[in-house]
Interface confidence: low
């Protein structure tokens, strides 16, 4: 399982996700933030 800061934040913070160019606040973890150092 993903255990890094990126993944923890995605699970807990309710990040916005992309869907067809429309922003939806659906609290689904996304891969948008793949950790950049």
């Amino acid at each position: 399982a993903c255990d890094t800061a990126t993944c923890v934040t995605h699970r807990l913070a309710g990040l916005l996700s992309r869907s067809g160019g429309v922003v939806k606040n659906n609290f689904v973890p996304t891969n948008v933030g793949s950790k950049a150092f």
């Epitope: 993903c2 255990d3 890094t4 800061a5 990126t6 993944c7 923890v8 934040t9 990040l15 916005l16 996700s17 992309r18 922003v23 996304t30 891969n31 948008v32 933030g33 793949s34 950790k35 950049a36 150092f37």
Partner: antibody, heavy 122, light 107 residues
Framework: EVQLVESGGGLVQPGGSLRLSCAAS????????ISWVRQAPGKGLEWVAE??????????HYAEAVKGRFTISRDNAKNSLYLQMNSLRAEDTAVYYC?????????????WGQGTLVTVSS | EIVLTQSPATLSLSPGERATLSCKAS??????VSWYQQKPGQAPRLLIY???NRYLGIPARFSGSGSGTDFTLTISSLEPEDFAVYYC?????????FGQGTKLEIK
């Protein structure tokens, strides 16, 4: 203007200690996760340590190679990051970069400093 | 530790050509992969995150693809300033790891 400026590098003998600093400006430092990443001369990149944001309790993680010898910390009031390096070895010789990261859902922000050189040699 | 293997080690191409760089992970990392460009004497520069998302200000000629264990960075038409070393990294598990780099040189 966003800036990360590392300092504290230099020549140190094996077994010695050094404290690196990274001064941040131009962004909300406390919201960012920060990593130290190093690069030995002529070699590739190696992650060293990470400290999470204030809201993530400033939790820390370390590479096995430095665990127990290096300590990462932050002072959000001073917009500063630190890396305390003890029991230094020749293989710790590298340019040390600090890199900040923030994910705001739609995209991310990622900033790097210019690096500071640490040389461990007798 | 997740090992990232980049290929080729060196890629010799001319401006205007298409560059395809590969990064293979020893374990599945979903899409938690980033790509960086580094020029001599400079800090790395983030190009792609989340396997396929272009970072702020990165030209459209840079694109990333892949998921699971196989990832690709493509530069559709090389500009003179693109010749540099490229690294992939993963942030799926600690420790974060980087590939060994691909040097993109002018033919």
């Amino acid at each position: 203007e966003v800036q990360l400026v590392e300092s504290g590098g230099g020549l140190v003998q094996p077994g010695g200690s050094l404290r690196l600093s990274c001064a941040a400006s131009g962004f909300t430092f406390s919201n960012y996760w920060i990593s130290w990443v190093r690069q030995a001369p002529g070699k590739g990149l190696e992650w060293v340590a990470e400290i999470r944001s204030e809201s993530d309790a400033s939790a820390t993680h370390y590479a096995e190679a430095v665990k127990g010898r290096f300590t990462i910390s932050r002072d959000n009031a001073k917009n500063s990051l630190y890396l305390q390096m003890n029991s230094l070895r020749a293989e710790d010789t590298a340019v040390y970069y600090c890199s900040s990261y923030f994910d705001y859902g739609l995209a991310i922000q990622n900033y790097w400093g210019q690096g500071t050189l640490v040389t461990v040699s007798s | 530790e997740i090992v990232l293997t980049q290929s080729p080690a060196t890629l010799s191409l001319s401006p205007g050509e298409r560059a395809t760089l590969s990064c293979k992970a020893s374990k599945r990392v979903t899409t938690y992969v980033s790509w960086y460009q580094q020029k001599p004497g400079q800090a790395p520069r983030l190009l792609i995150y989340g396997a396929s998302n272009r970072y702020l200000g990165i030209p459209a000629r840079f694109s990333g693809s892949g998921s699971g264990t196989d990832f690709t960075l493509t530069i559709s038409s090389l500009e003179p300033e693109d010749f540099a070393v490229y690294y992939c990294s993963q942030s799926y598990n600690y420790p974060y790891t980087f590939g060994q780099g691909t040097k993109l040189e002018i033919k």
